[in-house]
């Protein structure tokens, strides 16, 4: 085995020293005789040491001893000691005490034999064992004066060989992570929590991360244990985008033929039932009423026109009831109602005319007289030398309860090619031309159109007291919605509790699964903000879909096109949610179609207005938008534009 030069020297030095020991002792006796007992010259000293270096070292110092203690002849004991010590260059010991194993006296010199871990001429320099191959340590080498030792990083312990390290399994201690999951790692360990939770080292437990504090959501953020959900202003036409954090516009995904006809007059614009057109005719010359127009509707009931004076005088009202024309008239305070002719709410154009003759009124449909009524008097009434007639279209100038027979005045119908009193009517034409809301859709089908900008609501009761149950109330909510959506997000049906400003129930279209944070087209059934059931739907296929919802004590079902939806809650959660719903139903609730009022976006999974065609049946009764307590004026109650044909 070969040793490095320095170590080899250290190994050999003591042996060498022992070999010279005999000669050293002889030399000492010779020095005593020549230079201690006697005064010696340089040459005599040379004879003692038999070499120049030792002589050159000794002699100047010898003279120093003489100077200090006097000549040998004074017999000063200090002189003898002074001289005897001069040739031994290890006395006094020049080597470092800590690092020297032995001092070797050499010819005019000395050699410090170092202990292991020390070096330098005087063995006063610490050898850094760590500088070469890390001192043989696997991880950490600690150098120290004259020595070194190995240690390990945190999470490791030193093996019995004092050099290698082995991992400590901290997870063996059941208290390492407290409630959290412990995962051992090389030299460490990690306390793991489920997504949405973070480990608290103080509490040794998983704590919910409030992601909302991190500003992840563009609009409204709701934190939940282990998660969060972002909400967008649905009523403002926004929905969650693909990243589930930012918002984007709700855009139509099915184009509807919403083009309007500038030469048409829409009669259903005023939900209040007030007329869409008010005309007053005045003549010096006595004149008779002549009115003719083309008309189209699917609506079974409503007012086409009124002609006459104030409500207590003489007037006629042409209306629709059960799809047939009805004429209500009052002449000199005496009222009558006549109904006749074919069903005309078939959605096709037909020409209707009203003509006042000398002693009767004639109503015609497509030039065929369907009513001829004898009357005593004129509709134009004289006043201060002029004959007056008020004519209103799509409503009456007084309350419907003051009619001969009350009627719902609202009429979702369309008029064109009108002619009043054989006159050229530029006024209405000019007004309609610049006001698109007064115009009709060019083409319509049956249904109700929700334009994505408003809702309708009703005051309906969902509690019932069956005779066989006595006074105990039961409840049910059964909704059938026939929908042809134009957009992928919107409220179809909802209940609103005005007192609590809560949404006890909602059925809506949504394009993501909120808990799975997954984009998917769904129908959601929810009580307040909790989804009870979800069902996939092909919302943008331009086809009609049937959404059925049934809720009663103990059960809640959602079906789309006959396929039952997936429950999102446990049986216990369902019971709790249904109990919440029932509590709401015992207080006043309003039934909303096509949207919600201005509620917080977190009140329900969806707050956006529905866009598309829809008819709603609630508890086996078809909802008529003309009968609503309120309807947005852009919702058409009995007509819907068709889906635009695909471009060739």
């Amino acid at each position: 085995a070969l040793l490095p030069a320095r170590e080899a020297t250290q190994f050999l030095r003591p042996r060498q020293r022992r070999a010279f020991q005999v000669f050293e002792e002889a030399k000492q006796g010779h020095l005593e005789r020549e230079c201690v007992e006697e005064l010696c010259s340089r040459e005599e000293a040379r004879e003692v040491f038999e070499n120049d270096p030792e002589t050159d070292y000794f002699y100047p110092r010898y003279l120093d001893c003489i100077n200090k203690y006097g000549s040998p002849y004074t017999k000063n004991s200090g002189f003898a000691t002074c001289v005897q010590n001069l040739p031994d260059q290890c006395t006094p010991n020049p080597c470092d005490r800590k690092g020297t194993q032995a001092c070797q006296d050499l010819m005019g010199n000395f050699f410090c034999l170092c202990k292991a871990g020390w070096g330098g001429r005087l063995c006063d320099k610490d050898v850094n064992e760590c500088s070469q191959e890390n001192g043989g340590c696997l991880q950490i080498c600690h150098n120290k004066p004259g020595s070194f030792h190995c240690s390990c990083h945190s999470g490791f312990e030193l093996s019995s060989d004092g050099r290698t390290c082995q991992d400590i399994d901290e997870c063996a201690d059941s208290e390492a992570c407290g409630e959290a999951r412990c995962k051992n790692l090389p030299g460490s360990y990690s306390c793991l929590c489920d997504e949405g939770f973070a480990y608290s080292s103080q509490e040794k437990a998983c704590r919910d991360v409030d992601e909302c504090l991190q500003g992840r959501c563009e609009q409204v953020c709701v934190n939940s244990p282990g998660s969060y959900t972002c909400h967008c202003d649905g009523r403002g036409g926004l929905k969650l985008s693909q990243d589930m954090d930012t918002c984007e516009d709700i855009l139509p995904c099915v184009p509807f033929s919403v083009a309007k006809s500038v030469k048409s007059l829409y009669l259903g614009r005023m939900f209040s039932g007030t007329p869409v057109i008010r005309l007053r005719f005045k003549r010096l010359q006595p004149t008779r009423l002549v009115a003719e127009f083309d008309f189209r509707t699917f609506d079974p009931e409503g007012i086409l026109l009124f002609a006459g004076g104030h409500q207590d005088s003489t007037w006629i009202v042409l209306a629709l009831r059960a799809g047939r024309l009805e004429l209500q008239l009052r002449y000199n305070g005496v009222g009558r109602v006549t109904s006749s002719g074919p069903v005309i709410n078939h959605g096709m154009w037909q020409t209707i005319s009203v003509e006042e003759l000398a002693r009767n009124l004639v109503i015609k449909v497509n030039r065929d007289a369907v009513m001829k009524i004898a009357v005593a008097g004129d509709l134009f009434q004289p006043e201060r030398g002029l004959y007056h007639l008020n004519l209103t279209v799509g409503g009456i100038p007084f309350h419907e309860k003051d009619l001969v027979q009350p009627i719902n005045p609202r009429l979702d119908g369309c008029m064109r090619s009108w002619n009043w009193l054989n006159g050229e009517d530029t006024t209405i034409q000019e007004t309609v031309k610049v006001n698109t809301r007064m115009q009709c859709f060019s083409v319509t089908e049956r249904g109700s159109f929700y334009p994505g900008s408003g809702f309708a609501f009703y005051s309906l009761d969902y509690m019932r007291t069956p005779l066989d149950v006595g006074t105990e109330s039961t409840w049910e909510v059964e909704v059938v919605a026939h929908i042809r959506p134009a957009a992928d997000t919107g409220v179809l049906f909802a209940l609103w509790a005005p007192d609590l400003r809560a949404v006890p129930l909602s059925v809506a279209l949504v394009d993501y699964h909120s808990t799975k944070k997954l984009k998917k087209q769904l129908v959601v059934l929810a009580v307040e903000h909790t989804a009870l059931a979800l069902m996939e739907i092909k919302v943008c296929d331009g086809q009609e879909h049937v959404v059925t919802v049934s809720l009663r004590d103990g059960e809640a079902t959602l079906e789309v096109d006959g396929t039952r939806g997936q429950s999102e809650v446990s049986a216990a959660q369902l019971q709790e949610r249904l109990a919440v719903l029932e509590r709401h139903l015992r207080s006043p609730v309003l039934t909303f179609a096509g949207g919600l009022p201005d509620v917080p976006v977190t009140s329900a999974p969806v707050t956006a207005f529905y866009r598309g065609c829809m008819t709603l049946e609630v508890n086996r009764r078809l909802l008529d938008l003309d009968e609503a307590a309120y309807k947005h004026s852009d919702i058409t109650a009995h007509s819907c534009p068709p889906v635009e044909p695909a471009a060739a």
């Epitope: 007053r280 006595p286 004149t287 002029l386 054989n422 006159g423």
Partner: antibody, heavy 116, light 107 residues
Framework: QIHLVQSGPELKKPGASVKISCKAS????????MNWVKQAPGQGLKWMGW????????TYTEEFKGRFVFSLDTSVTTAYLQISTLKAEDTATYFC?????????WGQGTLITVSS | ETTVTQSPSSLSVSVGDRVTITCITS??????MNWYQQKPGKAPKLLIS???TLRPGVPSRFSSSGSGTDFTFTISSTQPEDFADYYC?????????FGQGTKLEIK
């Protein structure tokens, strides 16, 4: 298109008579009465009265009773204004206007100048 | 007979100015007031009919208000083509009566 076209200007001597015409087109003549309005030079408008185109019955305001006559020829859908025993103060532009309680459609006016 | 008093009889304004003309009736005529514009050598043109109704094709700078006996006609910002004579006409009762007229001149 509704039009009322009046006859041309007339220069007459005091004491003479004049008959001006107003030809109606573009609507049913007998459905609307015909009005007559006078405007003296630099003066305002004055309603003279009207004629029922169904019955031919005229109605005159107090100021225009006597020398003024409204008449019709329904076959040619024309209304006439005749002024007899003309006076200097009859110098004016006379307009016909269709009755609809107010006046929307007017003739272009006929200037009658009475001067000796 | 309902008399109509129109004021002022003449008015001198600059282009862009706001103009107001007033008519007062001797009886309550509800809102049966009409307003006409007449240019030299032409027939009057109906601008606003009963019920303060702006006639088709008439610019929106013309407006009127009033009911009962006090009526106001306004041009919000006078244009060069607006310099003409203006008349009010009540059509509540026979005889129909005009106001004396207002001459709108350029300043």
């Amino acid at each position: 298109q509704i039009h009322l076209v009046q006859s041309g200007p007339e220069l007459k001597k005091p004491g003479a008579s004049v008959k001006i015409s107003c030809k109606a087109s573009g609507y049913t003549f007998t459905n609307y009465g015909m009005n007559w309005v006078k405007q003296a030079p630099g003066q305002g408008l004055k309603w003279m009265g009207w004629i029922n185109t169904n019955t031919g019955e005229p109605t005159y305001t107090e100021e225009f009773k006597g020398r003024f006559v409204f008449s019709l020829d329904t076959s040619v859908t024309t209304a006439y204004l005749q002024i007899s025993t003309l006076k200097a103060e009859d110098t004016a532009t006379y307009f016909c206007a269709r009755d609809e309680g107010w006046f929307v459609y007017w003739g272009q006016g006929t200037l009658i100048t009475v001067s000796s | 007979e309902t008399t109509v008093t129109q004021s002022p009889s003449s008015l001198s304004v600059s282009v862009g100015d706001r103009v107001t003309i007033t008519c007062i009736t001797s009886t309550d005529i509800d809102d049966d007031m009409n307003w006409y514009q007449q240019k030299p050598g032409k027939a009057p043109k109906l601008l606003i009919s009963e019920g303060n109704t702006l006639r088709p094709g008439v610019p929106s700078r013309f407006s009127s208000s009033g009911s009962g006996t006090d009526f106001t006609f306004t041009i919000s910002s006078t244009q060069p083509e607006d310099f003409a004579d203006y008349y009010c006409l009540q059509t509540d009762s026979v005889p129909l009566t005009f106001g004396q007229g207002t001459k709108l001149e350029i300043k």
